[in-house]
Each structure stands twice: as C-alpha cells, then as structure tokens.
Interface confidence: low
C-alpha cells in the first residue's frame, strides 16, 4: 500500500508569493511559493495519486503583515481552502497567547491540530479540551493512518503560551500515544511536529512504532540529487534514521516559507512496515501557475493590509536617527529603539530567580536602512518601519559563549571608519572600544546586563559563560562577516518578524523618545 505525504513547515505567514529569498515578491515572473501556487501543485498530485495526505508541521503564524493584521484568521481560512489533513502546533502559534490560538485557528480549522506533549491545566483544561488533540486517526483510501503531534518544549522561552500549558519532553509524551494507536490496530503512524531536525531524528530513533517523522522548526532543507534553488541540503531526502529496534525510519522537513512542497512516497507492507520511501521537496517556482480562485481570494484579503500599513502605530517626539553615518559609526538612537523592542518582545518571566531569561541584543548597523523624522506630527506607520527594516528578517534567540560575543565585538570594529554594516548597535550591553589598538584587540570593556538578579546591573562579560542574545537572523546565519556567531552558536531559535517586533513595541509605548545613552563608548 502506497501513501503520498505532502508537507509544509515554517510557512510563517507567506500567503502571497515571495522572491527567491522569501522576502516580498518584486518581479512576479521570478517569484515562488504562496498558497495559490501551492494549491495548484497539491491538486495536481491529488488528481494523479490515490492516497494523499497534506500535512503541516507548525509555525504558520508570524512572519509578514498578513499575521500582524489577521492574527491567524488567514491561516485557518487558507489552510481550510487547501484542505490540509492535519497540522502540528509550532512555538509561534502561541505568539498571541493561548486566546490568539484558540479563537482564530483552533475553533476555525476544519482539520485536526495536534500536539501530544502539550498538557493543559487549571481553568484552561476545560476551555481548550478537544480543540487540539495528541493524535488523530485519518482514513486514507481503504486504510487508516495515525498522526501524532509534538511541539518544541522550549516554547515557553520562545513564545507566549501562558502558565496553564505544560510542555513535556517530546519522546516521553509521544510513546504512550503511539502505544495507544497500536492498541487501536493502527499500524501506520506518522509523527508530525515542530521541535527541530535533531529532535526529529531522536524521535525516529527512540519512539517505538513511529514509521515516518515529518518535522519543522529548524527550517531544514533535505534533497536527493542537484538542488533546484539556493538552499544547500543538510542531507538526503528522506533522511533515514535506524531506530533502536532496527527499523529504517524516514525523516523529512521542507525548508520554510512555503517555497517548497515536501513530497514523500512511502510503501507499506500489510503489517504496516515501511518497505520503501523516496521523494524530494518540489520547488514551487513560477513554472507552476497560481490557482485563480485562491489568488482572487488572496487579492480580496489583501485590501485590508494596504489600509493597515498607512495607519498610525504610535508617535515619536524625537528624531529617530537611522542614518548610516550614525548607525555604522557610533551608538544611534534608532539602534537603541530596535534593540529595546527586541528585548521587550522576549520578556518571559518563567523563573522567580530571573527578571528575564535574556537581557542582551546585538544588531548590525547596516541593517538599519532609514531614519524617521519626528516633524511629520511624530507619526510612525508600518510603512515607515518597512523603510527602516526592509529585508523581512526575524529577530532570533541564540545562545553563545562569552568568548564568541567578544569576537563579535572585535569584528564590529575590525575595519572601523569605512561605513561598513558590521558595526553593532546594542541593548543590555556596555562596550568600550579603543580604536588605537590593532584590529582584533580593540574591545577594552564589555559589560552585560545580568539576568539572575532582582535589580538588573552591568557585570563584566565572562568568556566561558553561556549567554542568551537576541539578534537578527542575518547575524545568526553569519551575515556581515559574523562567521563566529554561525560557527560557535550553541542554540538558535527563530523569532518574530522584525517589523512586527518594533511596531508592537511602539504601539505598546504609544509615545517614544529613545536617547543616545552611553551603550557604546570609545576610550
């Protein structure tokens, strides 16, 4: 018996087609992805093949103005239109709190939404009961397939699930649910979830009875043969893991942003064992036409977005200096504003001993592309912020050793004075440079804001300490020459859309007046 699994993950609000780098589509003839194009391909496969499942491994929420405005209603609407068979909850599904998941998505989705390792407690338990499930048994042709879901247990540090959801260890939570499916005579079981490729492989290895793992969170691109675009494969598709009980378990993921549709064909024997598996992600490029009815629906929903982008978010009573002559040479107040917003967006008081789990931000000055003049009645709009942060990136959470941070700050000024983009703006950090010293030895003081303290204060950076830092995904990926960050980071979790972070902060503060206050000094 043959099953075709179509899968997406980490779509992050890319409902419309995008450029090849998943930013805003500029030249339509070269654009990719989007739900209208995805629907064309899915329908084509559904017509050609008998047993097809369309699955999503989480993080539909967060990433473009679509989510900012529609807050998840767009996800339910278009996933329903594409007739998804199941979805796993990702960490970003909790970005607007549990209510922001329940109302727009859980109550509106016409497909099961899954996670076996999230347990509700207190008053939430009855409120959310039945709205998401640990597993679902789906009829496919003449057979049944069990889908069991999982979500990153780091979600409380990455999003806003509140205090009434407990995120358990994935493997511990999955095993009893898979065992339950086995007792129900379900012998073909897919683990669908959002914990990253390393955990996906561990689930394949450790959870007895899981036949296939469909993952997300780490934006992993797997491919067999010559890859069709810019993404470099992390391994073959499917990636085969040998389980502890000797089975070959295919593990798949389909990069991110709806650029590819994962396509995996599995052949099962009559006892539900995987005999063979093969496939590849399908690049959703312009050779695949956009479905006209879905496209018309997208255009209808778009109208509200255009109106939103010119509405006032808040006011500034000071000039927001985002000029390159400031932000690439010294502390600039636009950099301070953005870093303050980045920290504010990551406030998670999960432990009495810590005022917050993260206190530090770094931001490449070259990523700040425009100032905002306060003389326009102080008005700040989404459109203004899109000029400051035009690249459609995310502000991510990483863990780095102090020694890596020190290298990053040395890199920040290694060729100081040439208006290059690597000069770092900061939050929760006081740095002093001595530019008279040779490159690589210019940081004379680097103090960081404590987290394990009731009154935050600045302490010297410890080389062997591990620190959490918020930074642009561009830096996490080694951009602007920050190779040491990419090479030495201990953990990397994708965060929220950059403009959304700053716009939310401005809306919350209502009136802003960021200063230059001695975060960056030269001795």
């Amino acid at each position: 018996w043959e099953l075709t699994i179509l899968h997406t993950n980490d779509v992050h609000s890319r409902l419309e087609q995008t450029s090849e780098d998943s930013s805003k589509c500029v030249n339509a003839s070269r654009c990719m992805g989007g739900v209208a194009r995805l629907f064309t391909k899915v329908q084509q496969i559904r017509r050609a093949e008998p047993n097809v499942l369309l699955l999503d491994a989480g993080d539909q929420y967060q990433g473009t103005i679509w989510f900012t405005v529609y807050k998840g209603a767009e996800v339910a609407h278009f996933m329903n239109a594409l007739r998804y068979d199941a979805m796993a909850l990702g960490n970003h599904e909790f970005d607007n709190g549990v209510e922001g998941l329940i109302e727009p998505l859980l109550k509106e989705a016409k497909f099961p939404i899954l996670s076996a390792n999230i347990k509700a407690k207190g008053p939430l338990a009855s409120q959310i009961s039945g709205l998401y499930l640990p597993y679902k048994v789906l009829p496919v042709g003449d057979e049944v397939v069990g889908i069991v879901g999982y979500t990153s247990k780091e979600t409380p540090f990455l999003s806003n699930p509140g205090t009434n959801l407990v995120f358990e260890d994935e493997i511990t939570a999955l095993q009893p649910e898979v065992d339950k499916l086995k007792t129900l005579n379900v012998n073909k079981i897919i683990a669908l979830g959002h914990s990253g490729f390393e955990m996906d492989k561990l689930i394949a290895q450790k959870v007895r009875g899981v036949d296939v793992v469909v993952g997300g969170h780490s934006n992993t691109f797997l491919y067999t043969g010559n890859p069709p675009s810019k993404e470099v494969p992390a391994g073959k598709y499917p990636f085969i893991v040998t389980s502890d009980d000797g089975r070959k378990v295919p593990v798949v993921q389909a990069y991110a942003f709806g650029k590819y549709l994962g396509y995996l064909k599995i052949e099962f024997d009559e006892r539900g064992n995987v005999i063979s598996s093969h496939g590849n992600p399908i690049l959703l490029n312009s050779s695949i036409p956009e479905d006209p009815s879905i496209k018309a629906d997208i255009n209808k929903w778009r109208i509200k977005l255009d109106n939103y982008s010119t509405q006032e978010l808040g006011k500034t009573i000071v000039y927001l200096d985002g000029s390159s002559q400031s932000c690439r040479f010294r502390e600039c107040n636009m950099g301070n504003l953005i870093c303050d917003a980045m920290i504010n967006n990551n406030l998670r008081h999960t432990d009495e001993m810590f005022w917050n789990h993260v206190s530090m931000c770094i931001l490449n000055g070259g990523g700040i592309r425009s100032p905002i003049d306060e003389r326009n009645n102080g008005t700040i709009t989404w459109e203004n912020l899109a000029a400051v942060l035009p690249f459609g990136g995310t502000f991510d959470l990483v863990q780095l050793k102090g020694s890596t941070l020190k290298k990053a700050f040395e890199h920040s000024v290694h060729r100081y004075g040439q208006s290059t983009g690597e000069f770092l703006q900061v939050g929760g950090i006081h740095v002093v440079y001595d530019l008279s010293r040779k490159p690589g030895d210019r940081v004379v003081k680097l103090d960081v804001l404590c987290t394990k303290c009731r009154v935050p204060s600045y302490d010297p950076l410890k080389m062997d300490e591990v620190y959490k830092v918020i930074l642009p995904n561009f830096l996490a990926n080694g951009g602007d020459g920050f190779q040491m960050i990419k090479d030495e980071l201990l953990r990397h979790d994708s965060g929220d859309q950059d403009i959304n972070v700053v716009s939310t902060y401005i809306s919350k503060m209502k009136v802003i007046y960021p200063a230059v206050e001695g975060r960056i000094k030269f001795s």
Partner: nanobody, 113 residues
Framework: QVKLQESGGGRVQTGGSLRLSCAAS????????MYWYRQAPGEQRQLVAL???????YYVDSVKGRFTISRDDSKNTVYLQMNDLKPEDTAVYFC???????WGQGTQVTVSS
C-alpha cells in the same frame, strides 16, 4: 580555593548506565556554568556537556540523547547521567567551572563490550 570532587565512576557493560557526581566548593556555584570533560588514554581532554546557571544545557554530538547533565544548587553539585554507554565512552571524567581552573582527580569510567 576552588575544589572539585568527582565520583560515581566504575566498570559497566555496553548499554549500561552510570551517574557521576561532582561536588564543588570555593566558587559561587549558583551563578557559574558547570562543565563535564573527559580524557581518554593518550588523548586531549574534551568537553562532554555543560549546564549554565539557568539550567540551559549543551552536549557534544557523540553523547546527545544518551547523557544528561543536571545540577543541584542547594548541594553545590553537578551530575552526569550516562545511559546506553559505549566502549568509546571509556575515559576519566572531570567536572569544571571555568575551563583552565584547577582540575579535580576525575573519576574513571570503563565500558567493556
């Protein structure tokens, strides 16, 4: 004076388990990242795992999913639970706060096939 005392080593069969302990004194334990290292005969000392003051952990690839580092700040002790042991895990295991500080005596772990 930083003092580190490792214990819990021994000889086990492949697939067996051990729990190592390291009692620390002379450091502000609760605000210190703690590390487990190991040194096989004729090789350099290598990092195995670390745990930050916040409880965040890091493991080298070769032990991921098999070893678990934990800490008890009230006892100034860090632990290393080692499951599914393999012959290549045979080494002297050391704990440390900041690499480069004085090392303890270590505890010998021998895994036989």
């Amino acid at each position: 004076q930083v003092k580190l005392q490792e214990s819990g080593g021994g000889r086990v069969q492949t697939g067996g388990s051990l729990r190592l302990s390291c009692a620390a004194s002379g450091i502000s334990f609760s605000i210190t990242t703690m590390y487990w290292y190991r040194q096989a005969p004729g090789e350099q000392r290598q990092l195995v795992a670390l745990i930050t003051d916040r409880g965040n952990t890091y493991y080298v690839d070769s032990v991921k999913g098999r070893f678990t580092i934990s800490r008890d700040d009230s006892k100034n002790t860090v632990y290393l639970q080692m499951n599914d042991l393999k012959p290549e895990d045979t080494a002297v295991y050391f704990c440390n706060s900041i690499p480069g500080n004085d090392w303890g005596q270590g505890t010998q772990v021998t895994v036989s096939s």
